[in-house]
Amino acid sequence: AGVFELQIHSFGPGPGPGAPRSPCSARLPCRLFFRVCLKPGLSEEAAESPCALGAALSARGPVYTEQPGAPAPDLPLPDGLLQVPFRDAWPGTFSFIIETWREELGDQIGGPAWSLLARVAGRRRLAAGGPWARDIQRAGAWELRFSYRARCEPPAVGTACTRLCRPRSAPSRCGPGLRPCAPLEDECEAPLVCRAGCSPEHGFCEQPGECRCLEGWTGPLCTVPVSTSSCLSPRGPSSATTGCLVPGPGPCDGNPCANGGSCSETPRSFECTCPRGFYGLRCEVSGVTCADGPCFNGGLCVGGADPDSAYICHCPPGFQGSNCEKRVDRCSLQPCRNGGLCLDLGHALRCRCRAGFAGPRCEHDLDDCAGRACANGGTCVEGGGAHRCSCALGFGGRDCRERADPCAARPCAHGGRCYAHFSGLVCACAPGYMGARCEFPVHPDGASALPAAPPGLRPGDPQRYL
C-alpha cells in the first residue's frame, strides 16, 4: 500500500505564438481545480477507461479575475498535493491523465459551471520511494508543470511497496534470514507469509495468514476467476465453485452517470464513460466546444461551434483517441535490434539493450575486446558478449599470462625428444626421421621424403618448429 502524490507547480500559457484566451474575465471570475487519473502499466487506454490505480480531485484554487489588457499569466493554483492512495503493490509503470478544470463563479442558475480547460496524458516508469520526478506537458497553447512521486505507507517499503518492515526486536541486528530495511536501517524486513496455497498471481496478504484476492478472482485461495455467466443475476450468490460475484448493492446500481454515460465499477468506486461532449466524474459537465481547444497534440477540431453540438478531433499521424491524447503503439514495429526492449516514452522511442549490445537501437555489438589486453603477444577474439584470448605459442590461460609447456602434448612423433624453446618447441628426432615434428621418415637410400633439407640442416638434426 502507498500513495501517489502529484504537485502542480504552474498552469499557464505555453511558449511560442498563439497565447490562449484567459479562462476568466471580470464579468465571469473563475477558479481552477485539477483531476488526476492513474492506470497501471504502459497500456494505450482511452481517456475514458477506468482509472484502475485510482483518481483524485484537487481543492479549488483561488478566485481569479482577468486584468483587462494584461497577458494571461500563470493561473493561481489550489493548495496542497493531489494524493491517490493505492492498496496493492505499486506497478512501477503507469499511465496518467491530468485534467485542468475551470469553475465559473458568475450568476449561473443551478450553481457554478464547469468546463475542461486542458487534458494531458503520459506514460512513465517510477519506482516507489524515489525522489520527486519533474515533468512539463503541453495541451494546445497551455503548459502544465508538475512533479510526482510514489511513496509507501508504513510498514510497506521497497520499489513496489511489497516488503514490510517492523521495528527491531533486538537493538543490534535483525533475526535470522532477515535484512535491515533500507532506508529505515533501524527496522527489519518482516517475513510475510500468506495463507498456505494463496495464489501468488491473484492473491496477496497484508497480514500473515490471510489471502486477499485481486479484482477478478475469488475463492479462499484466489484461484477461481470471477464470472457472472453462471449466476442467477449479475450480482448473484457467492460461491467458490461458480465464482459468482458477492451479492449486495454495487457502486453502479442506479447508474450515477448522467447524460447517457455508462458506469463501470473500479476497486474503490465507479468510473463513468461519458458520451462525446460530456465530462466530469458523473458526466454532469457539458459545453466543451472547439473554442476550448479540446484536441491535443495538434489535432484539428471540427464542429462543436456551440455547447449543444459535439466536436470531433481529427488527429495528426501518430495520435489517436477522442481528444488525440493517446500515442499509437510505435513499439509494435519492433524497432529495437538484437532482442532489445522497446519503450515508447512519448517524445521518443528508447531501447533497453541486452547484455553485449548498445546504441539507440541496440545496433552495436559491444567490442568485447575493448580495454582487454591479451599478454605475451596474444590476440583477442570477440564473441557473444565475452572475450577470449588466442595465445601465442608457449603461453596459455585466460589472458595468456601463464607460460605453457609446449611439450605437454607430446608433439614429436616417432620417439622424437621435445625441448621447450623461447619461440615454441624443438624436436630432436630419432634416427631415421626428420621434420619439424619428426613426422617424415628418411628413406634407407638416404633420400628424404621431403624434397630437400633446408640449408645447414642435416637429416636427424633437431628441427626448430616456428
Epitope: L333, Q334, P335, R337, L349, R361, C362, E363
Partner: nanobody
C-alpha cells in the same frame, strides 16, 4: 526532415487486390524499421505488417496469408500487396518508419495515410 508518401489506396470489391506503396525521402542515413499501420473508424491504430529493426517481417494475425510486405532498399520504399480483401480491411492505411537521420539520431515518422475501402 523526412517525408513518407503513400499511394495505391482506393475502392475495391471483396476478394479483390490492391498494392500500396510508401516512399521515404529526406535526410535519411538508414531506415531501421518500416511498415504499415491501419485505423478503422472508431478503432485503435494497429500494425498490419512491417520490417522490424532486425529486418524480420511481422504480420497481424488477421492478414497472415493474405497480405505480403516487401521492400526496395535502393528506393527506400516498402510495398504492401493486399489480396483476398474483406470488408473489415476497410481503413486508412498509414506508412510508418523508424529512421536514422544523417545526424545519427533516430526518429519515428508517419505518412498522411491512404484510404482503402472494401465494399460490394
Amino acid at each position: 526532415e523526412v517525408q513518407l508518401v503513400e499511394s495505391g489506396g482506393g475502392e475495391v470489391q471483396p476478394g479483390g487486390s490492391l498494392r500500396l506503396s510508401c516512399a521515404a525521402s529526406g535526410s535519411i542515413f538508414s531506415i531501421n524499421a518500416m511498415g504499415w499501420y491501419r485505423q478503422a473508424p472508431g478503432k485503435q491504430r494497429e500494425l498490419v505488417a512491417g520490417f522490424t529493426g532486425d529486418t524480420s517481417t511481422k504480420y497481424a494475425e488477421s492478414v497472415k496469408g493474405r497480405f505480403t510486405i516487401s521492400r526496395d532498399n535502393a528506393k527506400n520504399t516498402v510495398y504492401l500487396q493486399m489480396s483476398s480483401l474483406r470488408a473489415e480491411d476497410t481503413a486508412v492505411y498509414y506508412c510508418a518508419a523508424d529512421v536514422q537521420l544523417l545526424n545519427s539520431d533516430y526518429e519515428f515518422y508517419w505518412g498522411q495515410g491512404t484510404l482503402v475501402t472494401v465494399k460490394p
